[in-house]
Every structure is written in C-alpha cells, then in structure tokens.
Amino acid sequence: EEELQVIQPDKSVLVAAGETATLRCTATSLIPVGPIQWFRGAGPGRELIYNQKEGHFPRVTTVSDLTKRNNMDFSIRIGNITPADAGTYYCVKFRKGSPDDVEFKSGAGTELSVRAKPSAPVVSGPAARATPQHTVSFTCESHGFSPRDITLKWFKNGNELSDFQTNVDPVGESVSYSIHSTAKVVLTREDVHSQVICEVAHVTLQGDPLRGTANLSETIRVPPTLEVTQQPVRAENQVNVTCQVRKFYPQRLQLTWLENGNVSRTETASTVTENKDGTYNWMSWLLVNVSAHRDDVKLTCQVEHDGQPAVSKSHDLKVSAHPKEQGSNTAAENTGSNERNIY
C-alpha cells in the first residue's frame, strides 16, 4: 500500500481581517493510526494551533467530523482573523506511539496572508499658532494595516502638496504596519478657511481612500492692521477718534486707549464683523472733548491680539486749531463701541 501523504492543496490563502480562514488538509490513507495537529511555523519554535487529541480552541473549528473512523479530511477554519494570525500553517500527521506520539509526515504548508484596513488617518498640527509666511508642520498617522504597501498624499484645499516625508514601520516583516508622514505648509493670510488633508490609499479600501483633515483656523494667527482716524461730531469742541482693527484672526483681542501715555479705557472685541476670508474687523471709538485740553493730545490705540505682544498706532490731536475732518470710515466696519468724554 502507498505511504500516507499529507496534502495541503493551497499554497496561500488571503483573508480580510475579521473574516474566517479555511486551511485545507487531507490525508491519502488511514494508516498509520494517529492524530493530526496543525502548527504555525516550522521547527522547534512552531506554535501549536490545533490538536486533534485535546485542547480548547475557541476560534478553530474542523471542517469535517474528525471522530469518524474513515475521516481523511483534516481541514480547519480559523474565525475572526487578525493580522497576528498571518504565517505558514502546517498540517502534521502523527503516528501513535508510547509514551508519545511521533511526528510522521507534514504537509507542504499554507501561507495565510491577512489584509487589514488602515485606521482612519489622524492629522495633527503645531502646538502653537503661527503667522502668515511661516512654514508649519503637520503630521498624519494611520495604523494596523496589512500588507505593507500603502500610498499617502497630502492636499491643501484640493491642491496636492509635495513637501512631505513618509515612513512605514516596521521596516522588516510584521503582522501589521503603521504609517507616519510629516508635511510642511506655508501659511498665507487667506488660510483661515483652508484645510490640510492627508489621504491614505490601501488595497483593502477598494479605491475609496481614507482621509484625515486639519483646519488651518486652528493653526494660523493673522495679526491685525490698525488705523486711527478723527472726525468732528456733535458740538464743535468734540472730536470722535476711531481705531479700525482690520483683518485679524482669531477673534481674541483686547484694545486699550491711551491719552498721553495714560490708560483711558480697555475693552475686549465682542461685536466683530467677519470678512469673506474668515478674518475679523472691529472698530473702537473715543469721544474727546478738546476744550478740556490746553495742549495737544497724543491718542494711542494699543491692541493685544491672541496673547501676543501689543501693537499700537498713535494719533496727534491738535487742540489749538479748529478740529476738522481728518479721516473717514465705512458703515460696514463701524460696528460701534463705548463713547468716552475727556474732561
């Protein structure tokens, strides 16, 4: 009679994570008597996956009833596959012995490959805000995918970026992999509404890449421009001085009026107008009674924006001459403030 052969017909099996893998194995004879065992890997370091004689295998089931006397099908199913299950599986026939069974013949092995989807990319930006013209770094991370081949692209407002570096770890063989990429982005004053997108394409995603986004509104700081103007109002001895604070982001802003270097009033930007580009405008005014002053008055509008060092703009108010209009402002920007008289 021909000697028993252990046949594993599939050289390789490809399974998606979470699915069930079927590892096929048949014997060509019932002799010699003895159990079948399944191992992952070969040699002394192999892992016992299934033992026909004994054991508890929550994820492993046999395809046929191994207790039947004439059974020669030793195929198994492994449920809820993860990347950690990848490897080469051997179906091994043992010959009954005393005290131990003796390994008789092994199948050629079936390589189980696991396809696992990458996790949703997570994009993170710099810890501190930066101003236009500065270059900032964004990182993108995705984990747990297999096989190793993966494509990562960066976009800013739909335009592909080229200044980035990407690493896939580990370099050698692994059950699953991670990708880490860092992109450099130059900020512009128009970036409040901009988005940076990290796009990951992998064989498991069937052409529908995963995307992670970061809003540049969380990264950018657009410093304000200041303009101080005066125009007469009401009586001839009163002058309205306005401070136009334009094109700033984020909204956090505190304004202080100084008269000849002395603090007159401090207020926080509240009722602001938003520009199309996402920046804000705000206006504060001061009502000055010039008859109360013998000398010229230096009025300073001092603005502290988003915790940064204060910027200021000054205006010299001539009290000797009859006050006349020295500037104007548009209705749209005139959002109002508190009035103050100087006596």
């Epitope: 002394p44 892992e47 004994e54 054991g55 295998f57 492993v60 131990d100």
Partner: nanobody, 124 residues
Framework: QVQLQESGGGVVQAGDPLRLSCVAS????????MGWFRQAPGKEREFVAG????????YYADSMKGRFTISRDNAKNLVYLQMNSLKPEDTAVYYC?????????????????WGQGTQVTVSS
C-alpha cells in the same frame, strides 16, 4: 533569559473568584507559550492550564476545565489565570511558566522558565 513574576494570590472564601497575573520580561513575549501550574503542600507540582503564543490554543487539566480560564495580553507581556468557584482543594502555590515549545499538556515537561509562585488559600 526570561523573568516571570506572579501576582494576585491571597486568601479567599470557597466559591469566590480570583485572578492571577504573571508578567514576563527578558524575551519577546509573543514567542513564548505560557502556562500555570500549582503545588499543594506535600504534593507534586501539577499542570493547571497552558496557552499558545498567540492565544489561539489553550489547554486545561481535567479537574479545572470550566472553572479556570487562561488568557494573555501580548501587548502588555501578561498572562492571566481567572479562577472561579474556588474550592479548598485549590489551595496551593501557583506558578507561572514559559516554554519555547508547546505541545499541549506536554507543557510541564517543556517549560524552560518558572516564576517564584504566589500563594492561594481557599478557606471553607
């Protein structure tokens, strides 16, 4: 070289549960098959449960089946033994063991490394 350190032992009432932990260091944990053994006073050390390196296959001594569950966390280098419905005859020193090869209940013979043990006392 592999270092094993058991914890979680103590004195419990009959019928109570207890979970033992064993942390391994010194070698890639996911390359080691792990097991639990116990030794009662005046008796030989006996096999309790074993688990393969990925956790896919588990083995239990007949007297512990259904009451004890072995599990592992390869990310934390930990192996656990959850013991339910404890009996006074479960009183023993419980040892954690690591093996480079694993053949089911042959594990006691194949164990290369042993912990110092943790005492479990079940009072009636």
């Amino acid at each position: 070289q592999v270092q094993l350190q058991e914890s979680g032992g103590g004195v419990v009432q009959a019928g109570d549960p207890l979970r033992l932990s064993c942390v391994a260091s010194g070698r890639t944990f996911s390359s080691l098959d792990m097991g639990w053994f116990r030794q009662a006073p005046g008796k030989e050390r006996e096999f309790v449960a074993g688990i393969s390196r990925s956790g896919i296959s588990q083995y239990y001594a007949d007297s512990m089946k259904g009451r004890f569950t072995i599990s592992r966390d390869n990310a934390k280098n930990l192996v656990y033994l959850q013991m339910n419905s404890l009996k006074p005859e479960d009183t023993a020193v419980y040892y954690c063991a690591a093996a480079l090869t694993f053949r089911g209940s042959d594990l006691p013979r194949d164990s290369n490394y042993w912990g110092q043990g943790t005492q479990v006392t079940v009072s009636s």
